[in-house]
Interface confidence: low
């Protein structure tokens, strides 16, 4: 059997392609015959299903070649708060020992992350015999779970959460250190494994693995909002908002922005992924009486989707009967 | 229980088409390569084809090369052999055959032999 | 023709001991595992010997393989009525890049 491909390396140049390049292996023990090229959609960090990224406005950033996430909070929070209930200039709010705690754990999070994504190395499968006739399992990251009291995060199953393994596909790669592999998921990562194969492959089975992580690129109008944007009138001064969310977005959406107002001035409502897998839309609650549009914005791991075209809807006023039994 | 089950077969005039499909249950059918297998009437077993794990690698016997395809479709668990260009030598009862565990890697390895079969299907080509 | 070579016909008393041969070549047998199957009338074939000796479980061991050079044998000792069959023997053939099979030995029980 050849010993491990060497310098395995890979770049994305589109939202659904990586390119993927190695050096031969510096023991071919015989002919080097074939390379096997195997790949596998890891799935997110189960944080990021959790974390409520309407709560204090962070906002997922790229920032590391390995395809890791970074959160950042937005330094600028446009839902400003008043200090002590007084007009005047705003200023931030001093931060609760909770605030500071999440923070100081996030922070933990981050660098445990960064670190286990950097030093992750393949621990090969228990040693079995080749007489054992049993299923082979697939090798994988397992997803982290992360223990936290904090405000900011859901306590709720994500469907997609519960994917934690995904196939590994697989293809065959003769004479030649490099390859290119389509048909992936946009802004998305992935490991892939390859595999140096000898004249004795047949016999023997090939190398273990040499691999890399590597993210697709975003593509460009996957976080748009697919369809229409709809409503249906509510009681108490509120209307209902429904939208389909889009269907192969970078990587996963993270929150909703929706825009609305009459003529006088914009409000602005998140929505967080949670709450939009628990009711498929949101409700907009204490609307004076008058004609409103609204717009609406997915927010993906790797940024915003375009806004939808505005919807119309209206808010009836209520009857001097209804007022008087209100 | 591991199932193999095997459809599609029929007659078929000379030159014409046909696509065999092989139904998978009972066990985790992404991890293992798949093979088929005819038999043609009274006559011996002959391997026409093998498709690794994922997909991505495929052989095939040089009487059929050219001619036929395998292919898998991992989420609907199923196998295919498509059948172009059909001589009266193909007639025969076609085995989609499971390949017994495979090294980490998911090469062509026969080591295991193919360990669960399925009960065939009949392909007559004649005129 | 077949690439590996089966006596056509093989046949014993319930009790006997009986062996069936399988001949092949460097490409074959000399470098690769030999599987054996065996066809009941009217059935599909079932995997006797895997890894030129092993059974899978469930094959009782009265069914015993082992490979030598280039030939490969399977052994049925305690012959039953039920062994009646056809049997097949299997390597990968590395310079054909295919898999193939002995011509089947018809297994009669006397």
């Known amino acids: 059997v050849p010993s491990i491909p060497l310098d395995v390396l890979s770049a994305s140049n589109s939202s659904s392609q990586l390119i993927v390049k190695w050096n031969p292996p510096s023991l071919p023990n015989g002919n080097l015959s074939y390379y096997i090229v195997r790949w596998q959609r890891q799935p997110q960090d189960g944080y990021l299903y959790r974390h409520n990224y309407c709560s204090k406005d962070k906002i997922p950033i790229r920032k590391y070649a390995d395809g890791t996430i970074d959160i950042e909070e937005v330094t600028e929070n446009p839902k400003t708060e008043v200090c002590g209930g007084e007009k005047g200039p705003c200023c931030a709010c001093p931060k609760t020992e909770a605030e500071k705690q999440a923070e100081k754990e996030e922070a933990e999070y981050r660098k445990v992350f960064e670190n286990f994504l950097h030093n992750s190395i393949f621990v090969p499968r228990p040693e079995r015999k080749r007489r054992d006739v049993m299923q082979v399992a697939n090798t994988t990251m397992s997803s982290r779970s992360r223990n936290t009291t904090a405000a900011d995060t859901y306590n709720i199953t994500d469907p997609e959460e519960l994917e934690t393994e995904y196939p590994f596909f697989e293809s065959r790669v003769d004479n030649k250190e490099r390859t290119v592999i389509s048909n992936l998921r946009p802004f998305t990562l992935y490991r892939i494994d390859i595999h140096s194969c000898n004249h004795e492959a047949e016999k023997l089975g090939c190398s273990a693995s040499n691999f890399v992580f590597a993210r697709t690129m975003p593509a460009e109008g996957a976080d748009d909002i697919p369809g229409p944007v709809t409503w249906e009138p509510r009681p108490e001064n509120s209307i209902f908002l429904k939208w389909p969310e889009p269907e192969n977005p970078n990587g996963l959406i993270l929150m909703y922005e929706i825009k609305y107002g009459s003529q006088v001035e914009d409000q602005r409502e998140c929505v967080s992924r949670q709450e939009y897998r628990k009711y498929g839309g949101a409700k907009l609650n204490r609307l004076n009486p008058g004609n409103y549009t609204a717009r609406i914005q997915a927010t993906s791991l790797s940024g915003n989707g375009s806004w939808t075209d505005p919807v119309f809807f209206y808010v009836q006023a209520k009857t001097g009967y209804e007022n008087f039994i209100h | 229980e591991v199932q193999l089950l095997e459809s599609g077969g029929g007659l078929v005039q000379p030159g014409g088409s046909l696509r065999l499909s092989c139904a998978a249950s009972?066990?985790?059918?992404?991890?293992?390569?798949m093979s088929w297998v005819r038999q043609a009437p009274g006559k011996g077993l002959e391997w026409v084809s093998w498709i690794s794990s994922g997909g991505g690698s495929t052989y095939y016997a040089d009487s059929v090369k050219g001619r036929f395809t395998i292919s898998r479709d991992n989420s609907k668990n199923t196998l295919y052999l498509q059948m172009n260009s059909l001589r009266a030598e193909d007639t025969a009862v076609y085995y989609c055959a499971k390949l017994g565990s495979l090294f980490p890697n998911a090469t062509a390895s026969y080591a295991y032999g193919m360990d669960v079969w399925g009960q065939g299907t009949l392909v007559t080509v004649s005129s | 023709q077949s690439v590996l070579t089966q006596p056509p016909s093989a046949s014993g008393t319930p009790g006997q001991r009986v062996t069936i041969s399988c001949s092949g070549s460097s490409s074959n047998i000399g470098s690769n595992d030999v599987s054996w199957y065996q066809q009941l009338p009217g059935t599909a074939p079932k995997l006797l010997i895997y890894d030129n000796s092993q059974r899978p479980s469930g094959v009782p061991d009265r069914f015993s393989g082992s490979k030598s050079g280039t030939s490969a044998s399977l052994a049925i000792s305690g012959l039953r009525s039920e062994d009646e069959a056809d049997y097949y023997c299997g390597s990968w053939d590395a310079s054909l890049n295919a898999y193939v099979f002995g011509g089947g030995t018809k297994l009669t029980v006397l």
């Open positions: 009972g066990f985790t059918f992404s991890n293992y390569a």
